[in-house]
């Protein structure tokens, strides 16, 4: 097979015919050295998935449920291109499965037992698989057959296409459970009508259903959405209140050697030549031979799925949970209102050791999961492999964009006992230089810079945001002659100054000696001209406070701060000489785990927090000899957020705006994936 060929998998005679037409028309518009199409015919989508895994084919377009099958071992396929619907300006690649109720009713998601339910149809995503999958562990046992368990959970339902003879309760609201539009409560509009007519108490539909059926906002305002955290929101807030986000139709390929760039090149060219309203002789998104062949007829085009986005992230935690529950039929033995152990995400082996020690001391209430970078940890929390971690504000922003929520803030200045309930204002991001140098904020060009890591607040977002507004471009590696900014491209001048050791050189974790606040300061001491750190860094590492060989003889007076007005001040004067105020680090978690994480951490800090005085023979949560492992070492306590419980509210408008501006320069693959 020529390496430029994409072997498309077709699942019927009609699809194979369209595939051949696709192949021939692409040949006529693409250069001979461009991508080409070959067609492989299989009996089913599952056979196509197996064929791609076995390298007998390269690509196929699948519905969400099949993307899940494709992702499971041993297939290990991943999404590479998404169909989009709607306009090019506002492309929709996902829809949201929602639970709609009337505003004048008074129950929540966890009070659905005994209510009347309206469904789009048996086995359908938004109307059955997702809601029933998520409710699965609340269904009465035995849970098989599933229809019987659902019939016993709700007091009456309309589930079009269900067997009304065996499960009459599922057809109580629509006698016969008709499987076509002859049943007035069939499909999306029908399920909504079932709610609207007062037959049912809740309708499981997609987010657009209510807008398609009620053009008038005043009418829509009579309805609300049930959220998974047992609150309600208005129908326009579906992005923050849904049962799951469901990808519409997706091209999948092998995770390794999957030709994803070639597939994108092919489909991008195909949509240019044969997309909506492009050509009379061949149309990608329709066919005289049948409906939805190879691609959905309703699709308007294709979007490349960001490379960081694997199937778990693409399908989303809620969707995977629902489908896994339905498929595997397993439920935790503990009641769902009881907190399971919290899986903490640790960065590399240094944090992992501290986490293990915490795990032992917590008697297993804390478990540990590891990742090599902060972004990998955030991804693990998103997909349920981990539950929580403490993050610098820059990563709180990324985590927030990825759907995680802040749970508790690290406090650095408030003494106990008021600490837990105090909202601190934040710390100062500063630029530190050697007293002996003649540097100012205005003559940093061509100098050697030391950063905590790319994407972090004091070390990157604040100084580079200020720099960007001055130089109006993102080529920071050209502005400084060299530097160490862990997380930069390995061949960048901003990795040149890093310490390593070798395989870990410039990695954004503790294996890189110049990582983090202490590492950036060490970089200044040993090699650099300026370090971007927090205002406490110099005092914490001078005057013998850090016993490491490189730091033990350092004096505070040998370092000064750069002020934005071009002057310099003593490190004792950060309030009058800083780059900006930075939000404190904060613990983040998935919404569904936030309460458990908060309860457990408040309990853990009472045992292992700053009230422990002897850390040489006792476990201390906020101590790691200046390494800031798991938490910053200067943390006094973890504090409640009260109403600052979203990333925007926590970080504040000014900081969010600054980071959003800097997104033009973003090198965050995770942020790209989460904003897809």
């Amino acid at each position: 097979v020529p390496e430029k060929s994409v072997r498309w998998c077709a699942v019927s005679e009609h699809e194979a015919t369209k595939c051949q037409s696709f192949r021939d028309h692409m040949k006529s518009v693409l250069p001979s050295n461009g991508p080409s199409v070959a067609c492989v015919k299989k009996a089913s989508h599952l056979d196509c998935i197996r064929a791609i895994a076995a390298n007998e084919a390269d690509a196929v377009t699948l519905d969400a449920g099949l993307v899940y099958d494709a992702y499971l071992a041993p297939n290990n396929l991943k999404p590479v291109v998404a169909e989009f619907y709607g306009s090019k300006e506002d492309p929709q690649t996902f829809y949201y499965a929602v639970a709609v109720v009337k505003k004048d009713s008074d129950f929540q998601m966890n009070q659905l037992r005994g209510r009347k339910s309206c469904h789009t149809g048996l086995g359908r995503s938004a109307g059955w698989n997702i809601p029933i999958g998520l409710l699965y562990c609340d269904l009465p046992e035995p849970r098989k057959p599933l229809e019987k368990a659902v019939a016993n959970f709700f007091s009456g339902s309309c589930v079009p296409c269900a067997d009304g003879t065996d499960f009459p309760q599922l057809c109580q609201l629509c006698p016969g459970c008709g499987c076509s539009t002859l049943n007035q409560y069939f499909s999306y509009s029908g399920a909504f009508k079932c709610l609207k007519d007062g037959a049912g108490d809740v309708a499981f539909v997609k987010h657009s259903t209510i807008f398609e059926n009620l053009a008038n906002k005043a009418d829509r305002d009579q309805y609300e959405l049930l959220c998974l955290d047992n609150t309600r929101k208005s129908v326009d807030e579906y992005k923050d209140c849904h049962l799951a986000r469901v990808p519409s139709h997706t091209v999948v390929a092998r995770s390794v050697g999957g030709k994803e760039d070639l597939i994108w090149e092919l489909l991008n060219q195909a949509q240019e030549h044969f997309g909506k309203d492009k050509s009379k002789e061949f149309q990608l998104f329709s066919s005289p031979h049948g409906k939805d062949l190879l691609f959905k007829d309703s699709a308007h085009g294709f979007l490349k799925v960001p490379p960081r986005m694997d199937a778990k992230m693409y399908l989303g935690y809620e969707y995977i949970t629902a489908i896994r529950n339905l498929r595997e039929g397993t439920c935790p033995e503990a009641p769902t209102d009881e907190c399971k152990p919290v899986k903490w995400c640790a960065l590399s082996h240094h944090e992992r050791l501290k986490c293990d020690e915490w795990s032992v001391n917590s008697a297993g209430k804390i478990e540990c999961e590891s990742a090599e970078t902060t972004e990998d940890c955030i991804a693990k929390i998103m997909n349920g492999e981990a539950d929580a971690m403490s993050l610098d504000g820059g990563f709180v922003y990324i985590a927030g964009m990825c759907g995680l929520v802040p749970v508790l803030a690290e406090n650095y200045n408030t003494p106990n006992p008021n600490c837990e309930n105090t909202a601190e204002e934040g710390y100062f991001a500063v630029a530190v230089v050697k007293s002996s140098s003649d540097l100012t904020w205005d003559n940093l060009k061509g100098k050697k810079s030391c950063h905590t890591a790319v994407g972090r607040t004091a070390g990157w977002n604040i100084p580079m945001g200020l720099l960007y507004s001055k130089i109006n471009h993102c080529r920071f590696d050209e502005f400084f002659s060299e530097g160490c900014a862990p997380g930069s491209e390995k061949n960048s001048s901003l990795c040149k100054l890093c310490m390593g050791p070798s395989p870990n050189l410039c990695e954004p974790n503790n294996k890189e000696g110049y990582y983090g606040y202490t590492g950036a300061f060490r970089c200044l001491v040993e090699k650099g001209d300026v370090a971007f750190v927090k205002h406490q860094t110099v005092p914490q590492n001078t005057g013998g406070k850090n016993p490491d060989a490189w730091a033990k003889n350092l004096k505070e007076e040998d370092y000064e701060l750069l002020c934005l007005d071009g002057s310099r001040k003593s490190v004792q004067e950060p309030a009058n000489c800083h780059l900006a105020r930075a939000p404190n680090h904060a613990v983040v978690a998935r919404k569904d785990k936030a309460d458990c994480v908060q309860t457990l951490l408040l309990d853990q800090q009472r045992m292992f927090g700053s009230s422990v005085t002897d850390c040489s023979s006792n476990f201390c949560l906020f101590e790691s000899k200046t390494k800031d492992l798991l938490f910053r070492d200067d943390t006094v306590c973890l504090a409640k957020l009260h109403d600052r419980n979203t990333y925007e509210k926590y970080l504040g408008e000014e900081y969010v705006k600054a980071v959003t501006n800097l997104r033009k320069c973003s090198t965050s693959p995770l942020l790209e994936a989460c904003t897809f």
């Epitope: 944090e351 050791l353 020690e357 001391n361 040489s616």
Partner: nanobody, 117 residues
Framework: QVQLVESGGGLVQPGGSLRLSCAAS????????MAWYRQAPGKQRELVAG???????NYAGSVKGRFTISRDNAKNTVYLQMNGLKPEDTAVYYC???????????WGQGTQVTVSS
């Protein structure tokens, strides 16, 4: 700094038992948490079991109910009693005292445990 020496490993059949010992050159009484780790070829080192000074214990899910960790502060020794051994328990077992404070890689030699018929 306390030096630790692991012993007691060996070749054992599936279902068999072994008792590993970890002897400290100094007093472990003042050390809060002691733990056993293991590393199988090509795999990451993982926590097997840990014990605090007050006797709180914690075990990896895969060994719960089969392994028991204990410590004798008077003898400056930590033990790992391993029952119902399985082939997947094959690894080098290391003892650590966490007083190294998380960022030095000075692990001991370890003791090899091989479970095979």
């Amino acid at each position: 700094q306390v030096q630790l020496v692991e012993s007691g490993g060996g070749l054992v059949q599936p279902g068999g038992s072994l008792r590993l010992s970890c002897a400290a050159s100094g007093s472990i009484f003042s050390i809060n948490t002691m733990a056993w780790y293991r590393q199988a070829p090509g795999k990451q080192r993982e926590l097997v079991a840990g014990i605090t000074r007050s006797g709180t214990t914690n075990y990896a899910g895969s060994v719960k109910g089969r392994f028991t960790i204990s410590r004798d502060n008077a003898k400056n020794t930590v033990y790992l009693q391993m029952n119902g051994l399985k082939p997947e328990d094959t690894a080098v077992y290391y003892c650590t005292d966490y007083s190294r404070r998380y960022y030095q890689d000075d692990w001991g030699q370890g003791t090899q445990v091989t479970v095979s018929s």
